[in-house]
Amino acid sequence: AELFLIASPSHPTEGSPVTLTCKMPFLQSSDAQFQFCFFRDTRALGPGWSSSPKLQIAAMWKEDTGSYWCEAQTMASKVLRSRRSQINVHRVPVADVSLETQPPGGQVMEGDRLVLICSVAMGTGDITFLWYKGAVGLNLQSKTQRSLTAEYEIPSVRESDAEQYYCVAENGYGPSPSGLVSITVRIPVSRPILMLRAPRAQAAVEDVLELHCEALRGSPPILYWFYHEDITLGSRSAPSGGGASFNLSLTEEHSGNYSCEANNGLGAQRSEAVTLNFTVPTGARSNHLTS
């Protein structure tokens, strides 16, 4: 009697199941009591000897490629051996690599967590994922895992993390890069500094006083509000960041406390107050202001 090993499917894709069947064309296995055993190269598979002529392999991997055969043993201990069958497990190359961010859109607050999620639409086996920073890539991390996605985490984002990023996936058929993703780090405004600038050391009535407010840190655009004794004088915008100025033509009523507020939508900060006092110098005809 002859024995045949049949693999179904005969050319499996990585990760898919395969059924091995030990066939006896001229003998019904019910005619006699047989025990079956399946082998790869020199190693017995599954449970070893069993009464079932089938062996189900849940998932085949590239490293499972090899020479398979089966043996059948009768009660009289006569052993039949099949010819070897070569089973080649097919690996699917990675395709359609994409990089996504958490939070979505690539905008993240300074100090918050950023996750760069690298995904492949197709690909089997061990996939190596690599993350790069900058258009000319600086390798940040690599991970090898048997999954279609992998994550790289920046637990607390800093201003210096604002850059372009991309990832690369590879499973033995050459690296495949994702598209670029840009990360914008949003920075709340720092407490602004208010400076009063006058055309001369002692400003006089009708002089133009410049109120200059500047937050040294903060993502643009920044909106500055100017106050005199908590009454709004007006606002100025700094679309590209930096400071902003508000001009005031002085009258005697302009004595008192001045402050400014910076707001970039991520929070507002108020400056310390700056006091402006009128002094009347001896023998002087006009009132003067000092701060």
Epitope: Y132, A135, V136, G137, L138, V168, P175, P177, S182, T184
Partner: antibody, heavy 119, light 112 residues
Framework: QVQLVQSGAEVKKPGASVKVSCKAS????????IHWVRQAPGQGLEWMGW????????KYNEKFKGKTTLTADKSTSTAYMELSSLRSEDTAVYFC????????????WGQGTLVTVSS | DIVMTQSPLSLPVTLGEPASISCRSS???????????LEWYLQKPGQSPQLLIY???NRFSGVPDRFSGSGSGTDFTLKISRVEAEDVGVYYC?????????FGQGTKVEIK
């Protein structure tokens, strides 16, 4: 297939501005940087800078800062290069090119746009 | 800025014979990530530049194997093993390691 198609030749007077377009097709526009390269008549190639169409963020060769403005319109997959305060020295062919990251090379180039500055 | 100096500036060649172009950078173009971003481009008459070699020695897809690149640090070479008629044009080396990125001044290859 990937294509970068640039706008036609321009003749401008000194002091004027010019805006050259580069329309991309056949790939995801926001996935790659677009670079600009200048070639003066009978001269070599000069790298001007790049723009990332994803967020419109440009990076300039210091030499071209203030002279050049790079922008991109995601809705039309078009990159733009604007030259201001034109002088006769700005007469050149301007190329846009796509640069592939990781492998790092310019794989596709526009056909070039000749800008002539003449009074 | 890094200056890329090519030699010779003009190279008359015989069809079927080898040709070699040298490119020297004014300082090392090894990037901080360990890669050397040295590329070679060919600009045929009336055309846009086209990529031949990237990262010193990697041939771009579709580029004939008669083209090869070599070198390290500051000295790089492009070799054509057997020149063909379609190889005429201006060859440029380019460094993309340090901003501003710079091209060599070009080498004009023509048939004798």
């Amino acid at each position: 297939q990937v294509q970068l198609v640039q706008s036609g030749a321009e003749v401008k007077k000194p002091g004027a501005s010019v805006k050259v377009s580069c329309k991309a097709s056949g790939y995801t526009f926001t996935s790659y940087n677009i670079h600009w390269v200048r070639q003066a008549p009978g001269q070599g190639l000069e790298w001007m800078g790049w723009i990332y169409p994803g967020d419109g963020n440009p990076k300039y060769n210091e030499k071209f800062k203030g002279k050049t403005t790079l922008t991109a319109d995601k809705s039309t997959s078009t990159a733009y290069m604007e030259l201001s305060s034109l002088r006769s020295e700005d007469t050149a062919v301007y190329f846009c090119a796509r640069r592939i990251h990781y492998y790092d090379y310019f794989d596709y180039w526009g056909q070039g746009t000749l800008v002539t500055v003449s009074s | 800025d890094i200056v890329m100096t090519q030699s010779p500036l003009s190279l008359p060649v015989t069809l079927g014979e080898p040709a070699s172009i040298s490119c020297r950078s004014s300082q090392s173009i090894v990037h901080s990530n360990g890669n050397t971003y040295l590329e070679w481009y060919l600009q045929k008459p009336g055309q846009s530049p086209q990529l031949l070699i990237y990262k010193v020695s990697n041939r771009f897809s579709g580029v004939p194997d008669r083209f090869s690149g070599s070198g390290s640090g500051t000295d790089f070479t492009l070799k054509i093993s057997r020149v063909e008629a379609e190889d005429v044009g201006v060859y440029y080396c380019f460094q993309g390691s340090h901003v501003p990125w710079t091209f060599g001044q070009g080498t004009k290859v023509e048939i004798k």
